[in-house]
């Protein structure tokens, strides 16, 4: 059998390899591990607490997910088909993450997080890509609502609310335009523009502003922003 696997086309991330029984680290990390080993115990302790925090976050993000069969029926011997929306794409080159050995940090009480299985890495990469697309979509929407292009900090909820109000205002203008056109054709009005047109659009410009909190990589049940989005849907 061969020494490694390679991946072609697509995929934006790295394909992590599993943690071996014997010490193991990716190449770049090997260098940093050497440097860390030479660092003071205090620095190592700081790194340890940071690493533990990172590990906890990763483990929250990597909770196992069960999936139904595509058609609601068992597929052969198990429920192994994912609905389209939850499928992951596999992430890229595994050899980027390969390293033959890992330094022993047990003296510092430091342990590196276990490498992810291929499937978990793919799922997380898929989720990262999804989040990027969502954020890109909001950025695009923000450019099309009043004040949005100038206000990059507009939150997702504010962007949606602003978009809804903007659409409603435009719809109202269309309705008014239709009414004016009909009245003009009936000979009721002279061909002058309704003064309400510009006022309606101008009133749209003042949208509330708050700090923009990114949900990049968030897998928590409901982030504050997601809760706000839920509230928004109720409002809508």
């Amino acid at each position: 059998m061969e020494s490694s696997a390679k991946m072609e086309s697509g995929g934006a991330g790295q394909q992590p390899q599993p943690q071996p029984q014997q010490p193991f680290l990716p190449p770049a990390a090997c260098f940093f591990a050497t440097a860390a080993a030479a660092a003071a115990a205090a620095a190592a302790a700081a790194a340890q607490s940071a690493q533990q925090q990172q590990q906890q976050q990763q483990q929250q993000q990597q909770a196992p997910q069960l999936r139904p069969a595509a058609d609601g029926q068992p597929s052969g011997g198990g429920h192994k088909s994912a609905p389209k929306q939850v499928k992951r794409q596999r992430s890229s080159s595994p050899e980027l993450m390969r390293c033959k050995r890992r330094l022993n940090f047990s003296g510092f009480g430091y342990s590196l997080p276990q490498q992810q299985p291929a499937a978990v890495a793919r799922r997380n990469e898929r989720e990262r890509n999804r989040v990027k697309l969502v954020n890109l979509g909001f950025a695009t929407l923000r450019e099309h609502v009043p004040n949005g292009a100038a206000n990059k900090k507009m939150s997702k909820v504010e962007t949606l609310r602003s978009a809804v109000e903007y659409i409603r205002a435009l719809q109202q203008l269309l309705d008014e335009h239709d009414a004016v056109s009909a009245a003009f054709q009936a000979g009721v009005l002279s061909p002058t523009i309704s003064p309400n047109y510009s006022n309606d659009l101008n009133s749209m410009a003042g949208s509330p502003v708050s700090s923009y909190s990114s949900d990049e990589g968030s897998y928590d049940p409901l982030s504050p922003e997601e809760q706000e989005l839920l509230d928004f849907t109720n409002w809508f």
Partner: antibody
Framework: EVKLVESEGGLVQPGSSMKLSCTAS????????MAWVRQVPEKGLEWVAT????????YYLDSLKSRFIISRDNAKNILYLQMSSLKSEDTATYYC?????????????WGQGTTLTVSS | DIVMSQSPSSLAVSVGEKVTLSCKSS????????????LAWYQQKPGQSPKLLIY???TRESGVPDRFTGSGSGTDFTLTISSVKAEDLAVYYC?????????FGSGTKLEIK
Amino acid sequence: EVKLVESEGGLVQPGSSMKLSCTASGFTFSDYYMAWVRQVPEKGLEWVATIDYDGSNTYYLDSLKSRFIISRDNAKNILYLQMSSLKSEDTATYYCARDGGYDEDYFDYWGQGTTLTVSS
Amino acid sequence: DIVMSQSPSSLAVSVGEKVTLSCKSSQTLLYSSNQQNYLAWYQQKPGQSPKLLIYWASTRESGVPDRFTGSGSGTDFTLTISSVKAEDLAVYYCHQYYTYPFTFGSGTKLEIK
């Protein structure tokens, strides 16, 4: 009933090319990763390549990457393996297999296999 | 690469006997975050293609007789056939799907006395 049927293999010259195909039925083809696994006569199984749902990501055994290309046509429910610069060591039975593809990369269904012989 | 080692390479047993096949991996196949072992077992009867028996190290594929049991964790795994039948004559392979390249053991050939 899930069915995977590989195309006919055959005898080919070293250095030549061959394209294997696998026609799937009995399941939603585009909902699954698919793979090729080969078996040298009287020897064990060797994973060759895997492809994701829509073909945007492919994975290969390192030694085969430069010569083998896995692809799929979801409209026709067909999986392909294009092999070039064939060597005598590529002589094997090639199996098409369905990969669970979510958190499950084991192969739950296999084709009957097609035998490729590379010899002059 | 993760190397999968199976033992014995072959064994001959009588019908009704209990059989234990061993598979060891060079690296752990247990992912701590979900406590899953990324290991499967396949059965390949003479002239046939492989058939999935066990996945996640211990989950029996539907339709597989309950005399087949998978166990083990980390690097040491076992496939047990509680009472061998004549139709169990086959080669049994273990397979790690933890990471690429996916690898298989060299197989254990089960023969019936």
